[in-house]
Interface confidence: low
Amino acid sequence: TPEVWVQVRMEATELSSFTIRCGFLGSGSISLVTVSWGGPNGAGGTTLAVLHPERGIRQWAPARQARWETQSSISLILEGSGASSPCANTTFCCKFASFPEGSWEACGSLPPSSDPGLSAPPTPAPILRAD
């Protein structure tokens, strides 16, 4: 069964800077990845970045750098300054659109006890969406 995993890490050097890593565990080819915060994309969440494996990347503040790590995983660095900066209990979600399986999404956040520089373990929590 396809899965999506999400890691959230607070950078030790910049306590208000976050790195989100997401990956897709499945056999299908990825057609689109959407990263959002505050909840799933389309369900109250706000889009931070859209990554298409062939056609490029869009990102919006406070996203600073979205990139592909592998053909099935991405990372996103968030700026940590200003009113729109993330906080420790912010939920981040990654949605992978994959043909022919459909869209799979998982969310994660920093565990309450996280030390700076440590990451939450991968949290696969796929939701099948027929969109």
Epitope: L32, E54, R55, G56, R58, W60, A66, R67
Partner: antibody, heavy 122, light 106 residues
Framework: EVQLVQSGAEVKKPGASVKVSCKAS????????IYWVRQAPGQGLEWMGT????????SYNQKFRGRVTMTRDTSTSTVYMELSSLRSEDTAVYYC???????????????WGQGTLVTVSS | QNVLTQSPATLSLSPGERATLSCSAG?????LHWFQQKPGQAPRLLIY???NLASGVPARFSGSGSGTDYTLTISSLEPEDFAVYYC?????????FGQGTKLEIK
């Protein structure tokens, strides 16, 4: 027939601003993003940024952050690129190109404007 | 930013010959696009997503590669192929182009 028609050549003084227009026709304007590329004389291509014509979102090359603004007018199917605080090194031909919207199939960047020469000189 | 380095800077060949243009990325990219530009004209998309021919592009053009190394090949040069060729990556922001390879008649 798909067409992107850009405004005419401009001569500007250092410190001034320039606003280049790109009028689209022959397709549904809001179905495609528009992106801007510039080319200094005898030089290569440089991506400046992209605007989503359907919801006005923009993504800029950080090199131009704070100086470039891309807007669109859906009533006239026109996209504008404004570059402020001009300097001599901004002298270039500025192109708009029709990009894809993320859910639409290929081709990628398949139509371009004819280019607008902006000369910055005191 | 991801710097794309094209080689050679200039390639001098005769019609009918095979042309091989290279593009090397500073860091790995998923896909690469190739554009052709003739003097006084806007660029024209040739190859998208590494190996796919854009609409109307002759079959003598082909693209290949992965990771950091990509190639554009023209199997048998026609007079209209002499131009400047640019590679472009869209795997990370800002999108970047190579500096170009000028293909000239020998």
């Amino acid at each position: 027939e798909v067409q992107l028609v850009q405004s005419g050549a401009e001569v500007k003084k250092p410190g001034a601003s320039v606003k280049v227009s790109c009028k689209a026709s022959g397709y549904t304007f809001t179905d495609y993003w528009i992106y801007w590329v510039r080319q200094a004389p005898g030089q290569g291509l440089e991506w400046m940024g992209t605007i989503d014509t359907s919801d006005h979102k923009t993504s800029y090359n950080q090199k131009f952050r704070g100086r470039v603004t891309m807007t669109r007018d859906t009533s006239t199917s026109t996209v504008y690129m404004e570059l402020s605080s001009l300097r001599s090194e901004d002298t270039a031909v500025y192109y708009c190109a029709r990009d894809f919207i993320i859910t639409v199939n290929y081709p990628v960047v398949d139509y371009w404007g004819q280019g607008t020469l902006v000369t910055v000189s005191s | 930013q991801n710097v794309l380095t094209q080689s050679p800077a200039t390639l001098s060949l005769s019609p009918g010959e095979r042309a091989t243009l290279s593009c090397s990325a500073g860091s790995s990219v998923n896909y690469l696009h190739w554009f052709q530009q003739k003097p006084g004209q806007a660029p024209r998309l040739l190859i998208y997503s590494t190996s796919n021919l854009a609409s109307g592009v002759p079959a003598r053009f082909s693209g290949s590669g992965s990771g950091t190394d990509y190639t554009l090949t023209i199997s048998s040069l026609e007079p209209e192929d002499f131009a400047v060729y640019y590679c472009q990556q869209r795997s990370s922001l800002p999108f970047t182009f190579g500096q170009g390879t000028k293909l000239e008649i020998k």
